[in-house]
């Protein structure tokens, strides 16, 4: 049945109703309001904003609108201690300094509070040595560095340019592999993509500019003080030294005009080969340290940010459900900014002002949804989702029991090329179904639906005629919902053609170019792209808080299952001896997926054919479908992990923002033949395969038939 | 049961050569740098080789370079040490083994070198 | 090259006791040190590796503490089959691999 037949319902009170009115303009307006000043988190400009979307979530009309504020860590700069990176000479004089911050965009000169670029939560210090150039310092680039070309970066500053993988893992890499301090950059091969102008003339990144982050390995700890708990008003806060997550040494962020400066004088090893080379005039020598005339020079870092106890501030609104009240359905995204947060994060955060004010005009009209849609406004995502980790952890109790579902909306684009998404296989046919009724923004398609386009430009890489659906990763506020509480989750947004831009991200990610004015004038003029993704947005939280059943399809989840297991097998196989060595078998997690293919079929059959006028058949019915995200969910977690707890996704441990499955099995196979003790490595295998075939045949079990 | 096996070893006459082989079973010879170590008469313990997975890199003590080579066939799982020229002071045990970031994890039960002056 | 220097080069003991074998290297090493024992007419066995991991199946009496360039063996209460001669090698700066000249631990 459809979602019109949700109470107090008038024919016009439907999904179409509520799509209907959604608009680009109002979208627009709430853009350009919410980016004239930066809104950093822990800041008063970013406390005012939360009060001013509390008041007008208000008047949108939600039945209560609250501010739930926490006093986590934060990361800032000194402000009369600027933090610097130089070259220094035998006499230790400063020959070169890199800038203490980014040209102000046209129109912006006299903005005050811009925080000038910094890695949030580097340590201060001012180490200084010889450079070694790293690549994007993944993983792989260590182990060529280190185990193919015999370079040795313990002692080293070294250089990484951003892309391919979460910044933080860079750090961590960095310092596990005995380097004294990281310097960041965006090398133009990443960062300006050709054939297009710099800002503000166009969406390229100048050579002054650059990107912000914190440089965290949390592991979805929360606030690095109170881990597993709210920081609350009583809270017990560990001592800094047993913070959770923060970088040992220091690092610091720089643009491609200062990294031509240090990368130009480089020496030592040439590039390994061509994927070590970006897109500047030098040339990209691995070190250590300057070539032969520049040879006695160094490098010297002056990092004298401070980790300061901060009050942050969500905005929680609630439009209570008329059937299932104690049934919740939550679309949050981030307010706080880098800076003025011109698509990271309010272009989110426009959708999200804007589907309250549709789902609020439909409520002043007679209608409720079925469940409880709760809304969120986080804060302190940019410093490590702190904002909604904190309000998970504070609500943890309530939400494992009624949590439905979750939305993400953080950026709404990050190209417009087509829709992105990634989401539980449990949303699969939800978005499948509602991107069908919803017509295509592009050029090319008109009068085509959204499913048209998005599956000519992005195909399912597995299935013809289907799009792309990606795995969830983290990077983003969902993490909590899904990794550690196993609420179904999702996020969607438009992004760029990956297969001709190869820079990662969006050039102006994080830096103060990220404007009003680039949305306007370059990506959205007539925000149609965001008016597609406030649909989608919108459409799947009403679907989810007004189907009378859940539009959840297990049987998505028994095919994904299958294709993970035939994949992490693969990974095994590729150590034939071993697997006969040390009686490595998969057939019980087989076995497990085999079972649950057979039990969400017969489930979906019931289904199907059970009495939806029964309102206690419908709820059980419905809790099934609720709780089968929770039944992946393993309260040890994953190892060194705990607050990843999710069997068959978690973010990869190389790279945050990318999902990685049945991850604890992938993680104990991941290197193996560079484990020196073999027999426990291969042990922690198999007891990772047991881990998983448990709780796969344990999640079918919560379809059976319940007596 | 993961075991390196040498085999090759014996009495040589100084400027003669020999050539030592080292079978493995247990795990994916493949994926593995492998190393000979030898050990003097009453002596320690001394590396003489290594050799990458895929074979296309190989390192020598400075007293072997030139007379000795280390290769390998991933096909038939099977390490090798090529001896030539070969003098009183290299008279040892030769162990094979694998090494995992230069940790030799697994030895041989290792072949005697005995070279008559 | 880097050397490894190891004292003791013989002791002797008896069952029950605790001994402590060390081991320097010429340079910093971090914690790339491993320990070998070897019996008579035997190939050597890993018994710890990154200065103090102990292999599986190695019994818990022997630990390995140390970092930079001071390392320690030590073995609480000793078993008869504990009588062996004990390497140190380094894996830190390679090639060459270097090892420990050698420590003999005789029955007293």
């Known amino acids: 049945k459809s979602s019109n037949e949700a109470t107090n319902i008038t024919p016009k009170h439907n999904m179409k109703a509520f799509l209907d009115e959604l608009k680009a303009e109002n979208i627009k307006k709430f853009l350009y309001n919410f980016t004239q000043i930066p809104h950093l988190a822990g800041t008063e400009q970013n406390f005012q904003l939360a009060k001013q979307i509390q008041s007008q979530w208000k008047e949108f009309g939600l039945d209560s609108v609250e501010l739930a504020h926490y006093d986590v860590l934060l990361s800032y700069p000194n402000k009369t201690h600027p933090n610097y990176i130089s070259i220094i000479n035998e006499d230790g004089n400063e020959i070169f300094n890199t800038s203490l911050f980014e040209p102000p965009p046209p129109g912006y000169e006299n903005v005050s509070d811009i925080v000038p670029p910094f890695s949030a939560f580097s340590p201060q210090g001012m180490p200084e040595g010889d450079l070694v150039y790293v690549n994007y310092a993944r993983t792989e680039d260590f182990f060529k560095l280190e185990r193919d070309m015999k370079i040795n970066c313990s002692g080293k500053i070294v250089i990484a340019r951003y892309g391919k993988v979460f910044r933080g893992n860079k750090v961590k890499n960095a310092q596990l592999a005995g380097a004294k301090g990281v310097i960041l950059y965006s090398d133009p091969a990443d960062y300006f993509a050709p054939g297009v102008k710099s800002y503000p003339d166009g969406w390229n990144l100048p050579g002054g500019g650059v990107q912000r982050g914190n440089i965290l390995n949390l592991n979805g700890a929360g606030d690095p003080l109170t881990p597993g708990y709210p920081a609350n008003e009583y809270a017990y806060r560990r001592g800094i030294a047993e913070a959770v997550g923060l970088p040992s040494i220091p690092v610091h962020p720089i643009g491609y005009y200062d990294a031509q400066k240090l990368l130009e004088k480089m020496g030592g090893s040439a590039p390994p080969d061509s994927s070590w080379r970006g897109s500047l005039k030098v040339p990209y020598n691995v070190g250590p340290g300057f070539t032969g005339n520049f040879s006695t020079q160094k490098v010297k870092m002056h990092i004298h940010s401070t980790n300061e106890v901060t009050r942050i501030y969500n905005v929680i609104g609630t439009l209570r459900g008329a059937v299932e009240p104690d049934r919740y359905v939550i679309l949050g995204g981030h307010r706080d900014s880098w800076v003025f947060g011109g698509i990271d994060p309010q272009s989110g955060a426009a959708v999200v002002h804007e589907i309250v004010r549709s789902f609020g005009t439909l409520k002043k009209e007679g209608w409720r949804p079925r469940r409880t849609i709760l809304f969120a406004s986080w804060d302190a995502e940019e410093f490590g989702l702190l904002g909604s980790t904190e309000w998970a952890e504070e609500n943890s109790r309530l939400l494992q029991e009624r949590g439905v579902a979750y939305i993400n909306a953080d950026s709404s684009i990050e190209g417009n090329y087509t829709l992105r998404v990634d989401c539980t296989p449990l949303m699969y046919s939800l978005v499948h179904n509602l991107t069908k009724e919803l017509k295509s923004p592009d050029e090319g398609f008109e009068g085509k639906s959204l499913y048209e386009s998005w599956t000519k430009k992005s195909p399912s890489p597995e299935f013809s005629g289907m799009p792309r659906i990606s795995k969830l990763g983290s990077g983003n506020d969902f993490e909590v919902f899904f990794q550690r509480l196993g609420i179904a989750s999702g996020r969607a947004r438009y992004t760029k053609n990956w297969e001709t831009n190869k820079f990662s991200g969006y050039p102006l990610y994080h830096s103060v170019y990220e404007t009003y004015e680039l949305v306007e004038k370059f990506y959205d003029p007539m925000f149609k792209y965001h008016l597609t993704v406030a649909q989608v947005r919108g459409g799947m939280v009403f679907e989810l808080a007004n189907s009378i059943v859940l539009p959840f399809d297990c049987r998505d989840y028994a095919v994904v299952l299958r294709k993970y297991a035939d994949k992490i097998y693969s990974i095994s196989m590729k150590h034939p001896q071993e697997m006969k060595t040390y009686s490595v078998s998969f057939d019980s997690l087989f076995s497990a997926v085999k079972n649950f293919t057979e039990i969400a079929s017969k489930f979906s059959e019931r289904l199907q054919d059970f009495d939806k006028s029964n309102p206690i058949v419908l709820r059980m019915m419905n809790d099934q479908l609720m709780f089968l995200e929770r039944a992946f969910i393993d309260p040890l977690g994953l190892p060194d992990r705990p607050f990843y707890r999710h069997v068959i996704y978690a973010p990869s441990s190389h790279n945050k923002y990318a999902g990685e499955s049945f991850p604890g099995i992938y993680d104990a196979l991941f290197d193996i033949e560079s484990k020196v003790d073999p027999s426990k490595a291969w042990g922690e295998v198999k007891r990772q395969i047991y881990v998983a075939a448990f709780t796969v045949q344990a999640a079918a079990e919560t379809l059976s038939e319940v007596a | 049961e993961v075991q390196l096996v040498e085999s090759g070893g014996g009495l040589v006459q100084s400027g003669g050569s020999l050539r030592l082989s080292c079978e493995a079973s247990?795990?994916?010879?493949?994926?593995?740098?492998m190393t000979w170590i030898r050990q003097g008469p009453g002596k320690g313990l001394e590396w003489v080789a290594n050799?990458?997975?895929?074979?296309?890199?190989?390192y020598y003590v400075d007293s072997v370079k030139g007379r000795f080579t280390i290769s390998r066939d991933n096909a038939r799982n099977s390490l090798y040490l090529q001896m030539t020229s070969l003098k009183a002071e290299d008279t040892a045990v030769y162990y094979c083994g694998r090494m995992i970031q230069f940790v030799i994890n697994i030895w041989g039960q290792g072949t005697l070198v005995t070279v008559s002056s | 090259d880097i050397q490894m220097t190891q004292s003791p080069s013989s002791l002797s003991a008896s069952v029950g006791d605790s001994v402590t074998i060390t081991c320097r290297a010429s340079?910093?090493?971090?914690?790339?040190l491993n320990w070998y024992q070897q019996k008579p007419g035997k190939a050597p066995k890993l018994l710890i590796y990154?200065?103090?991991s102990l292999l599986s199946g190695v019994p818990s009496r022997f630990s390995g503490s140390g970092s930079g360039t001071d390392f320690t063996l030590t073995i609480s209460g000793l078993h008869p089959e504990d009588f062996a001669t004990y390497f140190c090698?380094?894996?830190?700066?390679?090639?060459?691999?270097?090892f420990g000249q050698g420590t003999r631990l005789d029955i007293k």
């Open positions: 090698q380094q894996s830190f700066s390679t090639p060459p691999i270097t």
């Open positions: 050799i990458k997975p895929d074979g296309t890199e190989n």
């Open positions: 340079q910093s090493i971090n914690n790339y």
């Open positions: 990154t200065a103090s």
């Open positions: 247990g795990f994916t010879f493949s994926n593995y740098w």
